[in-house]
Interface confidence: low
């Protein structure tokens, strides 16, 4: 039927026009935001940061490697981003949180225990989809079993308790390169976000059979980018707005 075909084409065209319009508005909004950012930073043009520079600056961990490989940073294309977003669907965003210094952290041999994390206001307890703690374990010389413990520091109790367990796990490591290990910390993170005063930090331990700690907590020489960090995936369901 010629009429219905024509009608269908008009509808398709209408949808495409809406798509194009929507894409154009989105692009112009992004451009406007970029101009504002550049003016705040007193810059005329966007800095040209290569993938290699970013590789050096960011932790050398699997989730970040994947992100860098997935998106060519040099390609300034608004359709490629680490946010999947439009005004009608939930957006998910991955936030990488690096440890910071804290007054709360207990001192051991004059240096603070790792780690304390401060959270961006973007991270709200009911919006956390996933939270992984990533730790790097130094290479071993012989095949060995490693016992990993993640402890949450708490205010000392009457019986001397200063921490409570998040997770303990056993890993078999072979000689060669070190490994990145991730631990699910979603529940702990949600508790911290509900009660920020309970966030006194965590302690990371990864001992081999001889009692040597393999976890990189305070990177030494040649250990740049091997700090522990939190990978948090948050979701945001925006209110459906009329244009």
């Amino acid at each position: 039927n010629e009429n219905s075909e024509q009608k269908e084409n008009v509808e398709k065209e209408g949808l495409c026009n809406a798509c194009t319009w929507r894409q154009n508005t989105k692009s112009s909004r992004i451009e406007a935001i970029k101009i504002q950012i550049l003016s705040k930073l007193r810059l005329e043009t966007a800095p040209n940061i290569s993938k290699d520079v970013i590789r050096q600056l960011l932790p050398k961990a699997p989730p970040l490697r994947e992100l860098i490989d997935q998106y060519d940073v040099q390609r300034d294309d608004s359709s490629d981003g680490s946010l999947e977003d439009d005004d009608y669907h939930a957006t998910t965003e991955t936030i990488i949180t690096m440890p910071t210094e804290s007054d709360f952290l207990m001192q051991v041999d004059g240096k603070p225990k790792c780690c304390f994390f401060k959270f961006s206001s973007k991270i709200q307890y009911n919006k956390v989809v996933k939270a992984q703690l990533w730790i790097y374990l130094r290479p071993v010389e012989t095949p060995t079993t490693v016992f990993v413990q993640i402890l949450r520091l708490i205010k000392p109790m009457k019986d001397g308790t200063r921490y409570t367990g998040i997770r303990s796990l056993k890993l078999d490591m072979n000689p060669g390169t070190g490994i990145w290990q991730s631990i699910d910390v979603k529940t702990v993170l949600q508790n911290w976000l509900k009660q920020p005063e309970s966030n006194l930090g965590i302690e990371i331990k990864a001992l081999d059979e001889n009692g040597h700690d393999l976890a990189v907590t305070f990177p030494g020489p040649g250990e740049d980018g091997l700090n522990p960090f939190l990978e948090v995936k948050v979701t945001d369901t925006p209110k459906r707005s009329r244009r």
């Epitope: 413990q149 402890l151 019986d159 308790t161 409570t164 367990g165 303990s168 331990k205 001992l207």
Partner: antibody, heavy 119, light 106 residues
């Protein structure tokens, strides 16, 4: 193979103190944590406290705080547990046990030391 | 203080039976839980740590499960040498033991 060897049985009077030793052999003592657990006749296991052989830092169960002292001598790879103001209810077998680190299960145990408190 | 409650306090069983012992923590202890076997006049022996990891050399008929507050020790097919006392223990921070379970011959 790591072994923990404890001192022999003791008989004490109420109000006295007892010091039990636990010698570690076959391993790096300084990387261990030594805990003390006691068991009264026909009863269950009761954790008393622990000491880090590396730092000498201690943690005691609330019940024994002020009455128990745990120490170590790294030159002889020996840990000690001293319990003061003994009462008849302190009659028990006292065990030392090794943990690989602060929060670990006790994988190696001493043979136990019987302490009898009697007037 | 976190309390560890073990049940039952005793169980009568025959060789070949499947035996299940449970342990409940009064608060979340993640998987920082161990199971021990103790025979009369002997020191306890570690069987399972991290709630489900079998210590090397322990027969595979022993298994552990659970996380958080509820834990289980299972002996799939009881052997004559398994008649003993069993204790659970939380070992995070200040350790503490459950009251024990005596596995005796029916």
């Amino acid at each position: 193979q790591v072994q923990l060897v404890q001192s022999g049985a003791e008989v004490k009077k109420p109000g006295a103190s007892v010091k039990v030793s636990c010698k570690v052999s076959g391993g790096t003592f300084s990387t261990f944590h030594i805990h003390w657990v006691r068991q009264a006749p026909g009863k269950g296991l009761e954790w008393m406290g622990g000491i880090s052989a590396y730092s000498g830092s201690t943690i005691y169960a609330q019940k024994f705080q002020g009455r128990v002292t745990m120490t170590e001598d790294t030159s002889t790879d020996t840990a000690y547990m001293e319990l003061s103001s003994l009462k008849s209810e302190d009659t028990a077998v006292y065990y030392c046990a090794r943990a690989r680190y602060v929060d670990d299960a006790f994988d190696i145990w001493g043979q136990g030391t019987m302490v009898t408190v009697s007037s | 203080d976190i309390q560890m409650t073990q049940s039952p306090s005793s169980v009568s069983a025959s060789v070949g039976d499947r035996v299940t012992i449970t342990c409940r923590a009064s608060e979340d202890i993640s998987n920082f839980l161990a199971w021990y076997q103790q025979k009369p006049g002997k020191a306890p022996k570690l069987l399972i740590y991290a709630a489900s990891d079998l210590l090397s050399g322990v027969p595979s008929r022993f298994s552990g499960s659970g996380s958080g507050t509820d834990f289980t020790l299972t002996i799939s097919s009881l052997q004559p040498e398994d008649f003993a006392n069993y204790y659970c223990q939380k070992y995070i921070s200040a350790p503490s033991f459950g009251g024990g379970t005596k596995v005796e011959i029916k």
